[in-house]
Interface confidence: medium
């Protein structure tokens, strides 16, 4: 689902370079399924993760925590409204469920991915700041400031989305049996300006929720792969694998970031470049049949946020493997790492080992010169 | 060249069976929905029926409806007009003509109707006893 | 069934001058609309649709505008070949129905 609304598609027919356009078909219940799919493991994984850091004690979480669970709660309020989509699409795009749901599934699509960047980009920044510029900023990185930067980005997030809550609707377009949920720009545009309306918050989406965050991403990405990359040269080979290992982490979470998000963005982008450049007319069809694909691929972006921005933990495992064991021995989650420490937040800025730099037993470790040995990077 | 091409007019007695073919060319037949529109002579017109592309979606107005029935062969690119019970008012001037809609980008099924851009001749039919 | 209601009936005018027709729907159609011409012995041709989106290959003298249940087309500085009928048809919903007609007449 979009922000968008109707496409003037029309060719004349004395025009030689007409679109022959036709009802989209999706491929069977392939889009439903795949929905489902994301509901049950988004539901799973998100709720995992939010377990995973409200049973942590408070004074072990530190600032990265608060966009992780973010950035969860944000795929959770979406997914569990999958289930909607996957009858819509399955009902062949008839509508069931009432205006009210139409509107706040609509938002909630939204709201997700706004939050979803914004949290990814402040988790982001957060490992940047721990990182790159762990002793200037370490105030930066306090719990308060995450939790102003959160309820900012929240605020942030829901205002984006309002023109959907606003212009989604529903409606039986041709008088027919069959009830669509679509964009309804009527109440704020006349009829010439509709196409203003669809391109303007299309561009403003695609900029303020991909490009904008992106670009920060990749410039914080840029500057930890450039510190990690100074230390290769320094360290001992002991400390050379695990520093590719997190460079290697780092490279996954944005490349997946862009796989699942790129192709919705790029498509749309160079559909509303199409009015103006003209497209030829397979290249449009083209366009207009793959995108219900692509926004698919950025729905599945939420299920796999768990298993990509969490899962690459040590701790978070140890923390699931905790939970297992709590629900058969009702141990109660005080199992002890090899470290010595007991399983904390799996997202926590640092160690929470015996002390600063401190290893097993308090001795000093090695790695002390590099800010970065003990953060858990964790991205979404 | 685009063209629609309408045939099977004629004379028939009231309650009599009538059918009417459309032979299109030009372009991409499978693709569009299609519409019958007649004109009685020295009156207006009016919308009798449409078909989607694949024949799973049919409209009637309300007049010929459990009387007539819209058909199409995708592989001979025909439309048809069956029509049974005849009436002296369903004496006109048959048109065929080619459906245009406007396809929601974003919102998949939503679709938007801009009426009828390609039109055949005609093919006369008369009612009369 | 949605009425369209088209007014003048008919009118007489001269060569050059501007042509405004009405019509009105008898419930909100949004911007559905569209306007087709015909001469006599001939198909309708279609020269608007969706209210002000113009048919490729009509001449831009011909436009149109409105929404929800009053439209109009207009015709600036008539030419000889737009003498004809002209017809609306609102396209919001089944059945699809056309207005009465508007006879332009040479003066």
């Known amino acids: 689902m979009e922000e968008g609304g109707d496409f003037d598609n029309y060719y004349g027919a004395d025009n030689q370079s007409e679109c022959e356009y036709t009802d989209w078909k999706s491929s069977g219940a392939l889009i439903p399924a795949i929905y489902m799919l994301v509901f049950l493991l988004g539901t799973t994984g998100n709720g995992l993760v939010l377990w995973t850091v409200f049973r942590s004690s408070r004074e072990k979480r530190r600032s990265a925590d608060i966009f992780i669970a973010s950035l969860a709660v944000a795929d959770l309020t979406f997914v569990v409204t999958l289930p909607l989509w996957a009858t819509y699409t399955y009902r062949d795009y008839d509508w069931p469920f009432g205006t009210f749901f139409c509107k706040l599934s609509s938002y909630l699509i939204f709201v997700n991915m706004y939050a979803s960047v914004f949290c990814l980009t402040g988790l982001s920044f957060d490992r940047y700041l721990a990182i790159v510029r762990p002793v200037a900023n370490a105030r930066l990185r306090l719990r308060v400031s995450g939790a102003v930067a959160t309820a900012v980005l929240w605020v942030l997030a829901a205002l984006l989305a309002m023109p959907v809550m606003v212009l989604r609707t529903t409606g039986d377009l041709e008088n027919t049996t069959k009830v669509q949920c679509y964009m309804d720009y009527s109440m704020v545009a006349t009829v010439s300006s509709e196409w203003a309306w669809e391109v303007g918050l299309g561009v403003s989406s695609t900029t303020v929720g991909f490009v904008v965050p992106f670009t920060i991403m990749l410039t914080c990405y840029f500057f930890i792969a450039q510190t990690i990359a100074g230390h290769f040269r320094k360290e001992r080979i002991e400390g050379l694998r695990k520093r590719r290992r997190l460079l290697s982490i780092i490279v996954v979470l944005v490349v997946t970031f862009a796989l699942c998000w790129m192709p919705y963005h790029l498509v749309k982008t160079l559909y509303m470049l199409g009015s103006l450049l003209h497209w030829p007319c397979d290249f449009d069809l083209f366009l207009m049949n793959i995108f219900p694909y692509c926004t698919c691929i950025s729905y599945v972006n939420s299920c796999l946020n768990p298993f990509l921005y969490a899962f690459f933990d040590p701790r978070f495992r140890q923390a699931c493997t905790s939970m297992l064991c709590c629900g058969q021995s009702r141990c109660a989650g005080t199992s002890h790492s090899s470290s010595g420490e007991k399983s904390a937040s799996y997202s926590s800025g640092h160690s929470q080992g015996p002390g600063p730099n401190m290893g097993k037993g308090g001795e000093q470790m090695h790695e002390k010169s590099i800010p970065y040995s003990q953060e858990t990077l964790v991205v979404d | 060249e685009v063209q629609l091409v309408e045939s099977g007019g004629g004379l028939v007695q009231p309650g009599g069976s009538l059918r009417l073919s459309c032979a299109a060319s030009?372009?991409?037949?499978?693709?569009?929905?299609m519409s019958w529109v007649r004109q009685v002579p020295g009156k207006g017109l009016e919308w009798v029926a449409n078909?989607?592309?694949?024949?799973?979606?049919?409209y009637y107005v309300d007049s010929v409806k459990g009387r007539f029935t819209i058909s199409r062969d995708n592989a001979k690119n025909s439309l048809y007009l069956q029509m049974n019970s005849l009436r002296a008012e369903d004496t006109a001037v048959y048109y065929c003509?080619?459906?245009?809609?406007?396809?929601?980008?974003?919102?998949?099924?939503?679709?938007?109707?801009?009426?009828?851009?390609?039109w055949g001749q005609g093919t006369t039919v008369t009612v009369s006893s | 069934d949605i009425q369209m209601t088209q007014s003048p009936s008919s009118l007489s005018v001269s060569v050059g001058d501007r042509v405004t027709i009405t019509c009105r729907a008898s419930?909100?159609?949004?911007?559905?609309l569209g306007w087709y011409q015909q001469k006599p012995g001939k198909a309708p041709k279609r020269l608007i649709y969706?209210?002000?989106s113009l048919q490729s290959g009509v001449p831009s003298r011909f436009s149109g505008s409105g929404s929800g249940t009053e439209f109009t087309l207009t015709i600036s500085g008539l030419q000889p070949e737009d003498f004809a009928t002209y017809y609306c048809?609102?396209?919001?919903?089944?059945?699809?129905?056309f207005g009465q007609g508007t006879k332009v007449e040479i003066k």
């Open positions: 003509a080619r459906d245009r809609f406007g396809y929601s980008f974003y919102d998949k099924g939503v679709r938007y109707y801009y009426g009828m851009d390609v």
């Open positions: 030009g372009f991409t037949f499978s693709s569009f929905w």
């Open positions: 078909i989607k592309q694949d024949g799973s979606e049919k």
């Open positions: 419930q909100g159609i949004r911007n559905d």
């Open positions: 969706a209210t002000s």
């Open positions: 048809l609102q396209h919001n919903s089944y059945p699809r129905t």
